[in-house]
Structure formats: C-alpha cells, structure tokens
C-alpha cells in the first residue's frame, strides 16, 4: 500500500480467483484512543472498533472511503483505491490501446518544433468518475524538470456503437535548447483513477522522434503564361523552430484529381516553391517534414487548382 | 588541448554537399544494422545513448546559430570562453567563430572514423560475417574531413590483443551509429546555416 495523495491510498492487488488478497491496517488520525468505530462509504454498518482497523482487500467491493468516528463525529477518512495485477500484468482497463505506432500504445505525444513543448493525448470509453494526473521529466535516474498542465477533455467521437473520449495535456521542458542533441528521453507518467480503480501509464521518447510540423502556410498558386503549369509557393509554419536555415524543412507537393483513384503526381523539394501541372478539378497539397531527421510529415495544406 | 588551426574553404560549401552525403550514408548504415541485427538490441528505444565526443568536443555549442545564443538553456553547458565575449557574438560570422565550429566538427569526424575503423577490423574477424561497415560511409567521412581542410595529427587506430566479443561489438556498433546519426544531423543543420549566412 502506498499514498497517492493526502488520505488516498493505493492497494496493489495481485488478483486471481480465490486469491487471499492484501491485508491492510488503517489507523485513525486522532489522539483519541477509545470509543472509535469504522464505516465504509455511506453505509452505517460498523466494520470494527478501535484506533486501527485491519481489513482483507480481495476485490473492489473492499475498496472505498473508510471513516473513523467517535460519538457521531467524523475523525478521519482513508480512501482506498485498487491497482490490480492479473497474470503478472498491471491492468490497463481505463485507457484504450491506440495500436499506433505499435500495440500497447496508450499515450501518444507530438511536438510542433524543438522548443521542448509537446502535447500528449489518450483515449477512453469512460465518461464519468474519471481523473488524470500527469507528471513528466527528462530522464529518470537524475530527472530534469518538465512542467505539465492539467489534462482536459479535448474531443468526443462516436464510431458505430463506440463512444470515445480524447484527453490531452501540454507539457514544457523547463530549460530546453532547440539545438541540443538529446541523450536522455522525456518520460511521461499518467495516473488514471476511475471510481476506485487506479492505473498508471508511461511513455518515453525523444522530442526529435515525436516532431510533427504544422502544415505549410500561405499556400498560393501563380499561373505561368501560355502554360498549364503553375508555380506553387508556401511558407514555413509559424510554429516551426527558427532559424529556418538551421531547422530546415523538406516538402512534398502533390497534385490530386477529384477522384481518389486518379494517379497522384508528387514532387519533393527543399525549396518553398515548385512548378507543377494543374489539372482541371484537381487540388494541390503541400506537407512538410524535418529535412534532416525523418520524423512525421505534417498534415496537408491544400488549395484547389481552378 | 590545442584546437587545430583552421583554413576554412572560402566557398563554403562543398561541405554542405558532403554533409548531406554523410547523413544519407549513416542513416542507410543504421537502417542496415537494424535489419541485420534484428535480434540484438539495436533500436533507439533499446540502446543506451552514449556520445563518444562528450567532454572532448563541443560541436553543438560551438556551432550554435546566432539566434539561439540568446537562449539561456543553450548556453548552460558551454565551456568555451568566447561565448561571453560580446564582440564575438556580434560578429558571429568571423572566421574565428566559424573555425572553432568547423574544427569541432572535424574532431568529431576523426573520433568516429577511428572508432568505426577499429570496430570494422573486429567485425571482419567474426566467423558469422554478419555485418560490416559500409565502405561508402567511411569514404564520405573522409571526404568531409578533407573538405573541411584542417591539418591535425592523425590518431592511430586502436588495436586490441584480446579476443573480440562479437555480441558486444555489434551492440556497440548500434550505439555508435545512433549517436553518429544524431551528430550528422547537427552537422547538416550547421552546414545549411553557414551556407545560408
């Protein structure tokens, strides 16, 4: 058993059918010695008397808020949560496995640049009685500071008979140099509590591996005289690290017809303009990627040909 | 330690072309190592991230773009005295500043070249003949060093009398390649920046 925060304790339960459970001793936080009784949650049933209460925690029915009283007055509370392990594996029931980029991916994180700021998000199908707390650091043995905000509900999606809730959090490394070569990964730890269930999730990454630039901005077309060709131009996104001559991007320009089945013409360039043939009803899209370190491509910025 | 005296190439920038070749070559070699050594811990998540140039060169600091010299976090680890010299910061493009940066890159390349050659000699003794260093990568390191045009003492190749542990050697190869790829990215960024300046 360990303390999550004041008066909230986590019991680590190795669960299997007929498991003996964990013996827990609760102590009433009071100088009083006599006439103390214990109850669980809203029930008036007296579970025991005395300054300490010994309970056998076998299942969620044994968790909850234990209260010690004396003569109708509440003396102190202890909320017991369960962290369940089955077959040697801690439960991961609260969050959905996003399966991208690999199985058992519960937290996904992205950064728009090298400033040390990043966003993580996760999915759940639970709509109520749910709290998250996020901590982060650079490295784990001698951790350096990363400050995270509060996790907030950022999206709700309905997919067939599934309703999904997306939560996200923004974090910022306290002293980040955009040009630094990372040797210690960023660690992100999420504590999730649903009713009386406690779970924790972790992710470890280098900022360089989670970079995903914003789409190029100011995408414009300039028709070339007496030609079906157009000059496409764009700019680096505002959120990208500067100077751009050091933090350079590479771009992919795509001409896509109305129908998805039509052949796509693609051009790759390090410049912020390209000359392409604009077909009728087609659209031109441009996306960006770090020129030197192949992390994710940005989303597409698009403009119609007409 | 005395840094070698620099005679940077006036038209910067065959160096840019060579640094791009370097990044391509090390990325290809790393990909090949990951595939060939698929049952070894060779991914970024599995390896320890070690930097053989740590405390020996200061490429990131010496080659910091002018715009980032205002960022306190980028100056923390800088031991080089010129950083606090206002006139040097003001005239960042002076040959002295560039020389310091380029000589640090040269030293990096020299250290990695020695390590890779030593490692290749061991890998050639492996009866499994599982993986060798790409000669193209070694050639590209050499070309960039020549383009940087520094004169510095040659470092003798390390030789070891004991029987090599091939498993450890292959893991060390992965560690080296990951670190060298990260340094090659920095070198490419620097060359691109200097070229634009």
């Amino acid at each position: 058993i360990w303390e999550l925060k004041k008066d909230v304790y986590v019991v680590e339960l190795d669960w299997y059918p007929d498991a003996p459970g964990e013996m827990v001793v609760l102590t009433c936080d009071t100088p009083e010695e006599d006439g103390i009784t214990w109850t669980l949650d809203q029930s008036s049933e007296v579970l025991g008397s005395g300054k300490t209460l010994t309970i056998q925690v076998k299942e969620f029915g044994d968790a909850g808020q234990y209260t010690c009283h004396k003569g109708g007055e509440v003396l102190s509370h202890s909320l017991l949560l369960l962290h369940k392990k089955e077959d040697g594996i801690w439960s991961t029931d609260i969050l959905k496995d996003q399966k991208e980029p690999k199985n058992k991916t519960f937290l996904r994180c992205e950064a728009k640049n090298y400033s040390g700021r990043f966003t993580c998000w996760w999915l759940t199908t639970i709509s109520t009685d749910l709290t998250f707390s996020v901590k982060s650091s650079r490295g784990s043995s001698d951790p350096q500071g990363v400050t995270c905000g509060a996790a907030t509900l950022s999206a709700e999606r309905v997919r067939g008979d599934n309703k999904e809730y997306e939560y996200s959090v923004e974090c910022q490394e306290d002293s980040a140099c955009p040009a630094a070569e990372e040797s210690l990964p960023i660690e992100v730890m999420v504590d999730a509590v649903h009713k009386l269930k406690y779970e924790n999730y972790t992710s470890s990454f280098f900022i360089r591996d989670i970079i995903k630039p914003d789409p190029p901005k100011n995408l414009q077309l300039k028709p070339l005289k007496n030609s079906r060709q157009v000059e496409v131009s764009w700019e680096y996104p505002d959120t990208w690290s500067t100077p751009h001559s050091y933090f350079s991007l590479t771009f992919c320009v795509q001409v896509q017809g109305k129908s998805k089945r039509e052949k796509k013409d693609r051009v790759f360039t390090d410049k912020t303009s390209a000359t392409v043939i604009c077909r009728k009803n087609a659209s031109i899209s441009v996306r960006a990627q770090d020129r030197y370190y192949s992390s994710s491509w940005s989303e597409w910025a698009s403009v119609p040909c007409s | 330690r005395n840094l070698p005296v620099a005679t940077p190439d006036p038209g910067m920038f065959p160096c840019l072309h060579h640094s791009q070749n370097l990044l391509r070559a090390v990325s290809n070699m790393l990909q090949k190592a990951r595939q060939t050594l698929e049952f070894y811990p060779c991914t970024s998540e599995e390896i320890d991230h070690e930097d053989i140039t740590k405390d020996k060169t200061s490429t990131v600091e010496a080659c910091l773009p002018l715009e980032l010299t205002k960022n306190e976090s980028c100056l923390n680890s800088r031991e080089t005295s010129f950083i606090t010299n206002g006139s040097c910061l003001a005239s960042r493009k002076t040959s002295f500043m560039m020389a310091l940066c380029l000589s640090s890159i040269y030293e990096d390349l020299k250290m990695y070249q020695v390590e890779f050659k030593t490692m290749n000699a061991k890998l050639l003794m492996d009866p499994k003949r599982q993986i060798f260093l790409d000669q193209n990568m070694l050639a590209v390191i050499d070309e960039l060093m020549q383009a940087l045009n520094f004169n510095s003492e040659t470092v003798p190749q390390k030789s070891s009398l004991e029987e090599p542990d091939f498993y450890k050697t292959k893991i060390k190869l992965c560690i080296l390649l990951h670190a060298f790829r990260i340094r090659a990215v920095t070198i490419d960024r620097v060359m691109s920046y200097l070229n634009a300046s």
Epitope: P17, D41, E59, T125, V158, K163, K195 | -
Partner: nanobody, 123 residues
Framework: EVQLVESGGGVVQAGESLRLSCAAS????????MGWFRQAPGMEREFAAA????????YYADSVKGRFTISRDNAKNTVYLQMSSLKPEDTAVYYC????????????????WGQGTQVTVSS
C-alpha cells in the same frame, strides 16, 4: 446508455440446469465487466458471478462456485449464466449488471441493470 435484457428464466426441478442470457446494447458495451446478481423474496440482492470485459477472467460467489459458469460472446454482445445442479435456495429473480470495476461483488460498483428474470427451483 447501456440497456440489458435478461431471458431464459423459468421453473425447473432441483438438480436440473438452466441457462440465462443477457443481451447488452448501447455504447461501448464490449468494454463493460458483466455480472449476475440475484434477489430472493424478502432478501437483499446478492452477487452470483462476474466476468471481465475481455472474457478471460471470472469470479464467483462461494454459494455458486462449481455449479454456475459465467461466459460472454462479445460478437453477440451477450453474457450467459449456465446454472447446473440447481437447488431450491437458488430460487430468485436474476439480474444482469454492467460496470467497470472487476472483480466486484458489490452491487454499487455496477452502473447498469436489467429488469431481471425469475428462476424457480422446486424440490
């Protein structure tokens, strides 16, 4: 949000078997831990069995252990309670319940309940 409909109750002789079904519908039903509770006349509702959302783990009350088997078919969104060697004291209204805390024998830990199906075991 989740609807539960029980079926399969009836009158049987002691020692016979019966299979109860619980059809679940609504959002995210596959993510719920499912349980069966029962309530005899004049008694409190009591826990019988529960199954985890993956279906890989089951939990039984001592009074039904070895006689009842809970299972689920996530493709059909249905949970079953196979009852064998029935006794007169198994007579009760059987309720299907859905929740997110497994294992739990406490009714308060379940969020959704069916209307119940009557099982009568005559001697």
């Amino acid at each position: 949000e989740v609807q539960l409909v029980e079926s399969g109750g009836g009158v049987v002789q002691a020692g016979e078997s019966l299979r109860l079904s619980c059809a679940a519908s609504g959002y995210n039903v596959k993510d719920y831990e499912m349980g069966w509770f029962r309530q005899a006349p004049g008694m409190e509702r009591e826990f019988a069995a529960a199954i985890s959302w993956r279906g890989s783990s089951t939990y039984y009350a001592d009074s039904v252990k070895g006689r009842f088997t809970i299972s689920r078919d996530n493709a059909k969104n249905t949970v079953y309670l196979q009852m064998s060697s029935l006794k007169p004291e198994d007579t009760a209204v059987y309720y299907c319940a859905a929740g997110r805390l497994y294992p739990s024998s406490r009714s308060r830990d379940y969020d959704y309940w069916g209307q119940g199906t009557q099982v009568t075991v005559s001697s």
